[in-house]
């Protein structure tokens, strides 16, 4: 039950995280015009990964896409790449994890296969989250560097007479969305990996073996009862996951690679 909950929660958290990563990637407010200690302009500038926007005092907003690929800063290209990789890995992870969910039964898929898929999706979510966090952090670092550079020469004098307003940019809402979303995807991935350990028993506990007493067709399922002899008990103090009431045929599955430590 706990494993199913952990897996389900991991899936939901990752789903929210990936939705957040997609939202952050699409958002225009990666950097916003810094209004602190700056002349109050009647227009407000903000920029995203794909376009820059200007909101005028009338409320009219005009956005212009970056229609060049080669002319863009390498760092911006890197951030775009990281976010897209994060989204792609996250999307694949979600697809894999749907089939890996314990609560969803697909044909006669074994627990070992589900464990594999859960682990795979978990790793994908972790990498996806890390990509998003890395992308957002690279952009944030770029902003901080540019902020202090523009602060150093905020007003560039021309003959001491004319001043030029230097537009400084600070962290936009998308950065915070990206950081939170990346963190959630990462947490979801870790939860999936933890759920995978529960799905796959770490030692052979003879759960699937039928012991036939001579002349009788009675099947003993060691570990099912808390026998005082300790026979079939979890000698290593590790939780044995009993998948619930099943028919004998269902229980008799072949040992998988997860049964051997």
């Amino acid at each position: 039950m706990a494993v199913t909950a952990c897996q389900g929660l991991g899936f939901v958290v990752s789903l929210i995280g990936i939705a957040g990563i997609i939202a952050a990637t699409c958002m225009d407010q990666w950097s916003t015009q810094d209004l602190y200690n700056n002349p109050v302009t009647a227009v407000f500038n903000y920029q995203g990964l794909w376009r820059s926007c200007v909101r005028e005092s009338s409320g009219f907003t005009e956005c212009r896409g970056y229609f060049t690929l080669l002319g863009l800063p390498a760092m911006l290209q890197a951030v775009r790449a990281l976010m897209i990789v994060g989204i792609v890995l996250g999307a694949i992870g979600l697809l894999v994890s749907i089939f890996a969910l314990k609560c969803i039964r697909i044909g006669s898929m074994e627990d070992s296969a589900k464990a594999n898929m859960t682990l795979t999706s978990g790793i994908m979510f972790i990498v996806s989250g890390l990509c998003a966090i890395a992308g957002v952090s690279v952009f944030a670092n770029m902003l901080v560097t540019n902020f202090w550079m523009s602060t150093a020469n905020m007003y560039t004098g021309m003959g001491g007479m004319v001043q030029t307003v230097q537009t400084r940019y600070t962290f936009g809402a998308a950065l915070f969305v990206g950081w939170v979303a990346g963190g959630l995807t990462l947490i979801g991935g870790v939860m999936m990996c933890i759920a995978c350990r529960g799905l796959a028993p770490e030692e052979t506990n003879y759960k699937a073996v039928s012991y036939h007493a001579s002349g009788h067709s009675v099947a003993y399922k060691p570990g099912g009862f808390k026998a005082s002899t300790g026979f079939g008990s979890n000698t290593k103090n590790k939780k044995i996951y009993d998948g619930g009431a099943r028919t004998e045929d269902e229980v008799q599955s072949y040992p998988s690679k997860h049964d051997y430590v």
Epitope: T41, C53, V54, E56, S58, G59, T164, V165, T167
Partner: antibody, heavy 120, light 113 residues
């Protein structure tokens, strides 16, 4: 067609207050900001403040040090500008103007002006 | 506040001739975000409110004759009337439409020579 009709001329004593109204018609009042500009005799135009309906934000020229208050009555499609603690140098023609949304980004329609005379 | 300086204060030009009015701002009116200059030109005739001519330094308002044109960027701007007509006699104002408080130039009185 777009029209901004202002209230009539006023004569005020120093220290008093004046409230000028500006009734808009021919467009959706809540879509466009209203700006207030004054012009003293023989002087340049002077921006006083504005009201932005899209975010209910009001901006004022610091020069007026809290003496000016811009309000509006949406149901009557009317904007108001109140100037308090009047002095003789406040004698001017007061204009309301509509700031266009998008293109042009400017004050595209103006009221006819309200002459306010401050005299003891 | 941004100081807008217009020159000349008054200008007398013959009918059909070119009239040029200059405007200089103490700070750049160029917005880096969209590379637009937020400078506006108005025409004011005696006893009338100002009339919008040019916005964003070079865009002509609809209904304004094409003999009116605006140019310039950053801090230096020009209003040009290519062929002066009798109805163009007025005072012309440039305005900073970028940084609060919005400020106007002192005006240039255009007359016929």
């Amino acid at each position: 067609q777009v029209q901004l009709v202002q209230s009539g001329a006023e004569v005020k004593k120093p220290g008093a207050s004046v409230k000028v109204s500006c009734k808009a018609s021919g467009y959706t009042f809540t879509t466009y900001p209203i700006e207030w500009v004054r012009q003293a005799p023989g002087q340049r135009l002077e921006w006083m403040g504005n009201f932005h309906p899209y975010n209910d934000d009001t901006k004022y020229n610091e020069k007026f040090k809290g003496r000016v208050t811009i309000t509006r009555d949406t149901s009557a499609s009317t904007a108001y500008m109140e100037l308090s603690s009047l002095r003789s140098e406040d004698t001017a023609v007061y204009y309301c103007a509509r700031r266009a949304y998008g293109y042009p980004y400017a004050m595209d329609y103006w009221g006819q002006g309200t002459l306010v005379t401050v005299s003891s | 506040d941004i100081v807008m300086t217009q020159s000349p204060d008054s200008l007398a030009v013959s009918l059909g001739e070119r009239a040029t009015i200059n405007c200089k701002s103490s700070q750049s009116l160029l917005n880096a975000g969209n590379q637009k200059n937020y400078l506006t030109w108005y025409q004011q005739k005696p006893g009338q409110p100002p009339k919008l001519l040019i916005y964003r330094a070079s865009s002509r308002e609809s209904g304004v004759p094409d003999r009116f044109s605006g140019s310039g960027s950053g801090t230096d701007f020009t209003l040009t009337i290519s062929s002066l007509q009798a109805e163009d006699v007025a005072v012309y104002y440039c305005q900073n439409d970028y940084i609060y408080p919005y400020t106007f130039g002192g005006g240039t009185k255009l007359e016929i020579k």
